[in-house]
């Protein structure tokens, strides 16, 4: 069945019982997210207006799909899977009378089924699964899911701490030929290729066998430790870099006044906290950004966004994803992605991998 | 590449029966929901029955609620429409169209077969 | 039960005009709203999905907009080919259409 392709998920509750106040409905709705996005990598926020991924609506009789509500009784809401439009929708029968306790049906308990349905589950077999095809009250302050119901979700969307690199422990320097070593992020810089990790980068000069290891904060003080993404565009002498919802400018290798800004100034919904990955390709003058399984394109000419993304990494990029750490383009035909230990070299002319490498190869190691 | 081919149009009396198939090939048709659109000549577009994947819920417009069947064999990747008792309004061309959606129906047709005529008439 | 009430039925423009067609439900239906265009003899193509999602293939010169009981299709710049009838579609009912004619 289907699943959602990316890991922030945003759901709106377009309209509230009278049954229970405002504030009783919202914390109902979050914490039955929260069940799941205890046991998966999922991140779930509410928004209030716009369009979110799953619309939460109390509603009866006929209500805009061909699954009327019952009145009383009977079915009591329903969910479509993952997709777009009404895809991921949860429809609670307002006929019903919702409550915060044991009385009439409880929202937060019919709301965890729901938001499975949503997330792509289907009815299980077990009758102490929250799954389970009928309501039956179970105390709310001990419920948990059970273990069906953790196999299915984390089936579809892996366990929690799955895509969440483990920072370096002690924060002591990298052994640079470690297999397993990986980036967190990678960029062209003139003739260099700076290579971040940590508190640390590298410095490859290109074609040299040289390679030295520095403190980003002795190069850069007023910058932070971990950046995430960085791109360059050359013919501009700008380097940009990411970490978290912020990005720092640095122009001829000097930190510009007035940064950090928000990543939201470039378009992205708020839903996004972090870019993975970025680059730019001086070819089209465009800026990819790649966020969880997904990748932005951004002119930097027109300064915004290009229309009709995101769009899925694996989707565009044949061989590639579903999530990257690193990528810098380089030879006016390569980007060079990074994956955990592994580098793919992918001609973006020919729209293929054409080198799989170990992400240290370009130390001599 | 989707397609959808309607067959077993014609000309048919009043009171008469009919069945329509709706051959669907270059997707998964198991997983989705169907549904059969009509046109009457010179009208606008009706919705007369959808089905769930596994052949059930069916729904059915009012206007042929207790003539018209919907059905489905997944084994053949075939969509059915069993008419009976038509009258002169069920003259129209006959659509099958795929939802975008399994499980539940969302009421959202992407694809649609070219359609077959159906006339009631003596 | 919901009905769905689109205007105008018919309308005459001509190639580069901007053109507007709504469509309005009798209750709520949030963003559950779909147009199709039909070219005579042909079977209806989907345009516009979920009030405003464009279609993929469909050009950029269509748009959809609203949500609740009012909805729009606008069609930005119109070209020789946009000449057909346009329907909007909610669930099981669908408005009753719009001839976009040549002027």
């Known amino acids: 069945g289907p699943v959602w392709r990316k890991h922030y998920i945003t759901y709106r509750i377009n309209n509230y019982t009278p049954d229970m106040n405002r504030e009783d409905v919202d914390y109902a709705i979050r914490k039955a997210f929260q069940v799941w996005s205890n046991v998966t990598p999922l991140k779930f926020s509410k928004i209030n207006t716009g369009m979110a991924d799953i619309l939460v609506v109390f509603a009866r009789g006929a209500h805009g799909d061909f699954h009327a509500f019952d009145g009383k009784g009977g079915i009591l809401a329903h969910a479509f899977g993952p997709g777009s439009g009404i895809g991921g929708d949860a429809h609670f029968d307002e006929d019903e009378f919702w409550t915060t306790h044991s009385g009439g049906t409880n929202l937060f308990l019919t709301a965890v089924h729901e938001i499975g349905h949503s997330l792509g589950l289907g009815h299980s077999s077990d009758p102490k699964a929250v799954m389970f095809p009928t309501y039956k009250y179970v105390d709310i302050n001990t419920f948990r899911l059970s273990a069906d119901d953790i196999r299915g979700i984390q089936s579809l969307y892996g366990d929690p701490k799955e895509n969440q690199r483990l920072p370096n422990p002690d924060n002591s320097e990298p052994a640079l030929c470690d297999p397993n070593l990986s980036f967190d992020a990678v960029t062209t810089v003139g003739n260099k290729i700076f290579f971040f990790k940590d508190r640390f980068f590298w410095l490859k000069v290109s074609e040299r066998p040289k390679t030295s290891v520095n403190l980003i904060s002795s190069l850069w003080p007023t910058l932070p430790s971990g950046i995430e993404a960085a791109y360059e565009i050359e013919a501009r002498n700008q380097v940009f870099l990411f970490k978290d919802d912020k990005y720092w400018l640095i122009s001829n290798l000097r930190p510009e006044p007035n940064y950090p800004k928000s990543i939201h100034s470039f378009g992205f919904p708020n839903f996004v906290k972090k870019i993975d990955a970025a680059v730019f390709n001086p070819r089209f003058y465009r800026t990819y950004f790649f966020v969880d399984n997904q990748y932005w394109r951004y002119d930097e000419r027109r300064q915004m966004m290009d229309p009709g993304y995101p769009k899925l990494i694996t989707k565009n990029f044949q061989g590639i994803g579903p999530k990257i750490d690193a990528v810098f383009y380089s030879k006016n035909k390569y980007y060079y992605f990074f994956q955990g230990s592994n580098q793919f070299e992918y001609d973006f002319l020919l729209q293929r991998i054409t080198k799989t490498l170990k992400s240290n190869s370009w130390f001599g190691c | 590449e989707v397609q959808l081919l309607e067959s077993g149009g014609g000309l048919v009396q009043p009171g008469g029966s009919l069945r329509l198939s709706c051959a669907a090939s270059?997707?998964?048709?198991?997983?989705?929901?169907m549904h059969w659109v009509r046109q009457a000549p010179g009208k606008g577009l009706e919705w007369v029955s959808g089905?769930?994947?596994?052949?059930?819920?069916?729904f059915y417009a009012d206007s042929i609620k207790g003539r018209f069947t919907i059905s489905r064999d997944n084994s053949k990747n075939t969509l059915y429409l069993q008419m009976n008792s038509l009258r002169a309004e069920d003259t129209a061309v006959y659509y099958c169209?795929?939802?975008?959606?399994?499980?539940?129906?969302?009421?959202?047709?992407?694809?649609w077969g070219r359609g077959t005529l159906v006339t009631v008439s003596s | 039960d919901i009905q769905m009430t689109q205007s105008p039925s018919s309308l005459s423009a001509s190639v580069g005009d901007r053109v507007t067609i709504t469509c309005r439900a009798n209750?709520?239906?949030?963003?559950?709203l779909n147009w199709y265009q039909q070219k005579p003899g042909k079977a209806p193509e989907l345009l516009i999905y979920?009030?405003?999602s464009l279609q993929s293939g469909v050009p950029s010169r269509f748009s959809g907009s609203g949500s609740g009981t009012d909805f729009t299709l606008t069609i930005s710049s119109l070209q020789p080919e946009d000449f057909a009838t346009y329907y909007c579609?909610?669930?099981?009912?669908f408005g009753q259409g719009t001839k976009l004619e040549i002027k």
């Open positions: 579609q909610q669930a099981g009912i």
């Open positions: 270059g997707f998964t048709f198991s997983p989705y929901w």
């Open positions: 979920a009030a405003s």
């Open positions: 089905i769930g994947p596994s052949g059930g819920p069916t």
């Open positions: 169209a795929k939802d975008i959606r399994g499980a539940y129906s969302s009421g959202l047709f992407d694809y």
């Open positions: 209750q709520s239906i949030y963003t559950y």
